[in-house]
């Protein structure tokens, strides 16, 4: 959970000829207010589609009356931020619509009248917890300057507000596989619990109760392999019932990238690589200068003092793209051990460990014997995330709690009789045989086959097996 915050800096005439007429006049004083609508990354920007991430309305701005003959200045704005709370994870890529509304305060019958002055829309990448991002948008002859950010509400932290932090139960350390929550070093990450039944091999989650599938797998629990053999085309949305990829249009068909951007398909959608001077999900934002802060993720902007000269973003390590908006795939180096699944969450690499392993890189083989004593002198043997007890003589069962019948397996050969004994078993051999298990025949001349009978024992005497 968290809050998206929008700060409007100015709304007024854009540069260039054709300055708009002032929306207010002495006869019709008015005031402005703003509406913001947010949708997850790949949703359509159509104004009428629901604001799935949330919406907010600003307060009314100060009353403004145009001064006769004066050019339309930047109009007075409402105080404060527009805040859109979000309940679930922050999606990282989002669509926005910001509308500027005019409230006319004349002598209308039935109260004030409202009319839409301008609407701007776009798509952006934004990590929660980051600094304010600045933007500039034009709608007709109007220009809107604003900043925005997403921040998490405690106990959520991270770039998607999906990590949870809880006070430490012990003062010294966090539990196995859990790390301190920077910068809240006195708190620990809470474990992430995926949807019950989510495949540990083919599914993962970035928020509790979720089950997202790795490429090649589908179904609500990611247990259905995607099979393209019976399909007409290996593309399109997958069917959770058949696991077959249904033919459909490719996300890059018709090239959704504007302004000369090149399109590449991704497992879930498409990605545009934009030429310099353009950015946004579809390279739709232009006329940007360094003053607009086009470089994401701490990139350094060089050049681009005016809209006609291109800027260059010098990206910090680990980021790339013309606006430093893309992350380098660090998981390709396979840092997770013991078959752990690597997730690059942006702020950190996360390894989802297989059963029996823990630690930030799944490097710890869990001590399955810890706290699991084997009874009656048995010793615990661990391996592969499971444990078993190697029981002392005379005992059996999972924890060596059951008294074993040493004679159950009929250990005495050649018709020997078995007797249970406190230290094991005793075989009473039939005539003509000897040995601990009556395994050696006695030769007719009184000598036995190997090994020789120990001194003091005659052939046929019971042999105790220790």
């Amino acid at each position: 959970a968290g809050v998206f915050e929008l700060q409007i800096h100015s709304f007024g005439p854009g540069p260039g000829p054709g300055a708009p007429r002032s929306p207010c006049s002495a006869r019709l004083p008015c005031r402005l207010f703003f509406r913001v609508c947010l949708k997850p990354g790949l949703s359509e920007e159509a104004a009428e589609s629901p604001c799935a991430l949330g919406a907010a309305l600003s307060a009314r701005g100060p009353v403004y009356t145009e001064q006769p003959g004066a050019p339309a200045p930047d109009l007075p704005l409402p105080d404060g931020l527009l805040q859109v709370p979000f309940r679930d994870a922050w999606p990282g890529t989002f669509s926005f619509i910001i509308e500027t509304w005019r409230e006319e305060l004349g002598d209308q019958i039935g109260g004030p009248a409202w009319s839409l002055l301008a609407r701007v829309a776009g798509r952006r990448r934004l990590a929660a917890g980051g600094p304010w991002a600045r933007d500039i948008q034009r709608a007709g002859a109007w220009e809107l300057r604003f900043s925005y950010r997403a921040r998490c509400e405690p106990p959520a932290v991270g770039t998607a507000c999906t990590r949870l932090c809880r006070p430490r139960s012990a003062p010294s350390r966090c539990g196995p596989g859990l790390r301190p929550c920077a910068p809240l070093e006195d708190e620990c990450e809470a474990p992430l619990v995926c949807r019950a039944g989510c495949s540990p091999e083919h599914g993962f989650c970035e928020q509790p109760g979720e089950c997202r599938c790795l490429e090649g797998w589908t179904g609500p629990l990611c247990t259905v392999p995607v099979s393209t053999s019976s399909c007409l085309s290996p593309r399109g949305p997958s069917s959770a019932t058949t696991g077959c990829l249904v033919p459909g249009p490719g996300p890059c068909d018709g090239n959704p990238c504007a302004n000369g951007g090149s399109c590449s398909e991704t497992p879930r959608s498409f990605e545009c690589t934009c030429p310099r001077g353009f950015y946004g999900l579809r390279c739709e934002v232009s006329g940007v200068t360094c003053a607009d802060g086009p470089c994401f993720n701490g990139g350094l902007c060089v050049g681009g003092a005016d809209p006609d000269s291109a800027y260059i973003c010098h990206c910090p390590p680990g980021f790339q793209g013309s606006n430093c908006e893309k992350r380098v795939d660090r998981c390709s180096l396979q840092p997770c051990r013991n078959g752990g699944l690597c997730l690059d969450l942006g702020h950190a690499l996360r390894c989802r460990c297989r059963a029996g392993f823990a630690g930030p890189r799944c490097e710890h083989d869990l001590d399955d014997c810890a706290g699991r004593a084997c009874a009656n002198g048995g010793t615990c043997v661990e391996g592969g995330g499971a444990h078993r007890c190697s029981c002392a003589l005379g005992f059996g069962g999972r924890d060596c709690r059951e008294r074993a019948d040493p004679c159950a397996a009929r250990p005495c050969a050649h018709g020997g009789r078995c007797y249970a004994h406190f230290s094991g078993l005793v075989c009473a051999c039939a005539p003509g045989y000897m040995g601990a298990r009556c395994e050696f025949p006695v030769h007719p001349d009184g000598a036995s086959a190997l090994p020789a009978a120990p001194p003091g024992l005659r052939p046929g005497d019971p042999q105790r097996y220790l």
Partner: nanobody, 119 residues
Framework: EVQLVESGGGEVQPGGSLRLSCAAS????????IGWYRQAPGKQRDMVAG???????TYAESVKGRFTISRDNAKNTVYLQMSSLRAEDTAVYYC?????????????WGQGTLVTVKP
């Protein structure tokens, strides 16, 4: 803080060879995974070769059979022997490492070394 310093880049003709070195320095650290990434102008930064967290070597398909990664644990150095170089191997080559410092893991990048393959 761990520093990764690359060296060995330069200009070479197609079919030629180069050997890149990456030396890791710092205090009280251990390397979990380490390898080489490269970035050609206007392209993505992609993994070329590396030692995984398990210590196994991994290579990008495009360099298999031509590039060999090796390491000298005593010197905390990793090498990339590049042979049969092609024009498409031209890029800035970056050393990258997943490093354990205390109980935490951090990712580090080197500054990069330029490899140019041209006739």
């Amino acid at each position: 803080e761990v520093q990764l310093v690359e060296s060995g880049g330069g200009e070479v003709q197609p079919g030629g060879s180069l050997r890149l070195s990456c030396a890791a320095s710092g205090s009280d650290f251990s390397i979990n995974a380490i390898g080489w990434y490269r970035q050609a102008p206007g392209k993505q930064r992609d993994m070329v070769a590396g030692f995984t967290g398990e210590g196994v070597t991994t290579y990008a398909e495009s360099v298999k059979g031509r590039f060999t990664i090796s390491r000298d644990n005593a010197k905390n150095t990793v090498y990339l022997q590049m042979s049969s170089l092609r024009a498409e191997d031209t890029a800035v080559y970056y050393c990258a490492a997943d490093v354990k410092i205390g109980g935490d893991y951090e990712w580090f990048w080197g500054q990069g070394t330029l490899v140019t393959v041209k006739p």
